[in-house]
Every structure is written in C-alpha cells, then in structure tokens.
C-alpha cells in the first residue's frame, strides 16, 4: 500500500551535547496520485514524486523514502469468529412441502422455534451468537444449520474459538440425547433423533499477526517481528524502542538496513564512541579539535 | 393476522359434560396443529389434546376417555367434547396452534393463543 509521509524530527541529545535528528514517521494514510515529471529517480524503493514530495511505499520513509521505518501499522479485526456446520434430526416436528420455502410462514415459524430451542441449549457459551438455518429436508425434519461464534480478538483467540466448538459439540450432543419422543410426543419445546446430530465443518477466522507483519516489511521481513503490548500486536524493528526486542544504540541512532539493525555511533566535542552498540567511548586528547 | 377465539366454558356439576369450541380466523385450518391447554390456580399450563391437519390426535393421560378433541376444517373451528367432568377439571382452557405438524406437548412450541374460557366443576 502507497502511504504519505509526513516527516517531522525529533531531537535527541547525548550527555555530551550533541544531537542527531531522527524522523517520527506517520505510515497509515493511504494515497494514490501520479508521478510527475522527470523526478522518478529521486524516489527510491518504489516511491514515486508527487510534485511535492517522494510517496513512499510501506515500509520506506524520508525524503527519497531512503530509510527503513521502525514500526508498521498492522491491524487484527476486532472480532474473530467460528461457523460451525450442524444437522441434527427433529422428531416432534413432521416435515411438509412448505418448510422447503424459506419465504412461507411455516419455515418462518420453525425457524423461530429451532432458534429458540437452540439459544436455550447454548445459552451458557459467551461466544454463542446465533443459529442460521441453510436447509431443511424430510427426515421427520433435518436441520442443517450453522451455528455462529464470536470472540474479541486476542493472542490466544483460537484456544478460546476451539474451546468453544468443543462445548457446542457437547451441549448438542446433550440435549439430542435427552429430549426424544415418549410414545410418539415430545414434552420438551423440540425433540430429536439422537442419531441424527453431526458437525459437517468447521471454519475458524485466520488472522496471523506475524504473516501480515513479514508481508508488510517485504525485504526487512526477517528483521521485524511481533511483540505484544496490552494483547495488541506490534510489528516492529529492533530500531523501535520500548520492547523486548529493542536494540540499545547507548550513543548512536539505530538504522535498519538490509543485513538487519545496526548502530550508527555519535562523534561528540569530547569523545567518539564505537563498538556494535556505541558503548565504547574513547575521551579526545584535549589538543585536538574536531570539526 | 392469526386470532382464536374460545367459548363454550361455564359452570358444570361433576359428571356432567360440556363443549368448548374455538372458532380461528386468519389460520389455515387444513394445516398444522390445534391443541387445547388449560390453566389451573396456581398450576403450569398443561397439555389437554392434540389434533394435526391428518386428523391425528393425542391426550393428557388425565383426559384420556373422557375428552375427544376435533375440527372442522370448513368452518376453521376446533372442538373439546369434554364428558365426566371432575373438580379436578376446573381451570382456565386455552385453544393454542402453530402452523407446524407439531407432536410435542409444550406449550411453548405453540406461537397462537386464544384469551381462554372458564370451566368450573364444582356441586
């Protein structure tokens, strides 16, 4: 995706003085616009100039979109969800030509009883959200229905997706065993033909935090990984500060570059600093003057 | 819109017999199930009879023999010939339906009620 980048810096100053601008980066707003002019080559990584400024493309900033940004926007839904496809055979209903039409009021009817029946049976699981029926056909009355699950989106949705399909298994296995016909009546709002209750399928939502950070970080995806921060996921480089992951440059900028995150160590009045993280300080001889 | 409208209750000596009828408008009364329900003081409302658009019927255990449910279909009524009348009898009947060949006894399954008629068995 084409992002807008709004460059503004942020000053840091070491102990000694001196400073290094480093851009904040705002990666979220998509654009589409032309390329003008003969000012192609001045964007790099796939930017193009808009008559302005280089448009950069994900995961690239700054004024040629030359740098790597630290951190990319990724996005889980909100909600995941399960749909789970069951039949299960009700006795106490005889099956008719009407119930075929999903527009009749008979369907209409039985609908709206089966719902309520199933609401009653699931109404202890907080993913339940509702039943949907796709067919019915003769057999007193197969049901072949979906039932539907949702959860808020976490780390560990699937667990809490599974569980979930697992205690709908088990409550429709209950209650068709339990409510069935006694000399040809039923005393419960549906009974069931306990033989008759199988789950088809079921589909769990995908959502893969680390698979849409790598996708989006294309060439660097082996640098940037996952973190979480308050069960939200956070597609970071090891230049992003405030995760575990975070590499400590002590007196340097952290840059990313394609061999992965390095330091770029300061030069300041009194020292040079070295080392894979700039924490070697060697004091200037005091004759000597840099410039 | 289904309306059911019930008549035919009072007060009976026991041994005596009485007939209740519901008359159904805006119910296609050659389909589904009618049944009639009744309501003591205090008590659940109970299943008393069942009659499907084939003409099939079943009874509450305490009814059986006494009471004999049926429709007609031309004039969308339903019918409780109700014999041998006992205290025990005396409650509020309600004519209930549902467009569904229903063979369950719950009253819950039956989306259409009648407002009821008193039947009072007592010397």
């Known amino acids: 995706p084409l992002a807008t980048i709004p460059v503004s810096t942020t000053s840091l100053t070491s102990s000694e003085g001196s400073t290094i601008s480093t851009p904040s980066v705002d990666i979220s707003t998509p654009v589409t616009t032309s390329i003008v002019g003969d000012q192609c080559s001045r964007c790099k990584n796939g930017g193009f100039w808009d008559g302005l400024k280089c448009q950069c493309l994900t995961p690239y900033y700054g004024e040629s979109c030359e740098e790597v940004v630290n951190s990319i926007d990724i996005a889980p839904p909100e909600t995941v969800s399960a749909q789970m496809e069951l039949t299960v055979t009700v006795t106490s209903v005889k099956f008719t030509d009407e119930l075929k039409n999903h527009s009749s009021q008979e369907f209409r009817e039985f609908n709206k009883t089966f719902t309520e029946q199933m609401n009653i049976v699931y109404s202890g699981i907080p993913e339940y959200v509702g039943v949907n029926i796709t067919n019915l056909r003769l057999g007193s009355v197969v049901v072949e229905h979906d039932v539907l699950l949702r959860t808020k989106y976490t780390p560990e949705y699937k667990t809490a997706l599974d569980n979930a399909t697992e205690v709908v298994k088990q409550k429709i296995t209950k209650v068709t065993t339990e409510q069935i016909m006694t000399n040809d009546n039923c005393s419960a709002l549906m009974c069931f033909n306990t033989t008759g209750t199988q789950v088809q399928n079921i589909t769990v939502t995908q959502y893969d935090p680390v698979e849409e950070c790598r996708q989006k970080a294309e060439e660097y995806e082996d640098y940037f990984l996952v973190e979480y921060r308050d069960q939200k996921p956070y597609c970071i480089s090891p230049c992003e500060s405030g995760f575990n992951a975070s590499k400590n440059c002590n007196h340097g900028k952290c840059q990313m570059s394609q061999n992965g995150a390095r330091c770029l160590c300061v030069t300041t009045e009194t020292h040079w600093y070295s080392g894979e993280d700039c924490n070697q300080g060697t004091q200037k001889s005091h004759h000597h003057h840099h410039h | 819109d289904v309306q059911l409208v019930e008549s035919g209750g009072g007060l009976v000596q026991p041994g005596g017999s009485l007939r209740l009828s519901c008359a159904a408008s805006g119910f296609p009364s050659s389909r589904g199930t009618m049944a009639w329900f009744r309501q003591a003081p205090g008590k659940e409302r109970e299943g008393v009879a069942f009659i499907n658009s084939d003409g099939r019927t079943s009874y509450a255990e305490s009814v059986k023999g006494r009471f004999t449910i049926s429709r007609d279909n031309a004039l969308s009524s339903l019918y409780l010939q109700m014999n041998s009348l006992r205290a025990e009898d005396t409650a509020m009947y309600y004519c209930?339906?549902?467009?569904?060949?229903?063979?369950?006894?719950?009253?819950?399954?039956?989306?259409?009620w009648g407002q009821g008629t008193q039947v009072t068995v007592s010397s």
């Open positions: 209930a339906a549902s467009l569904l060949y229903l063979m369950t006894v719950n009253a819950a399954a039956y989306p259409y």
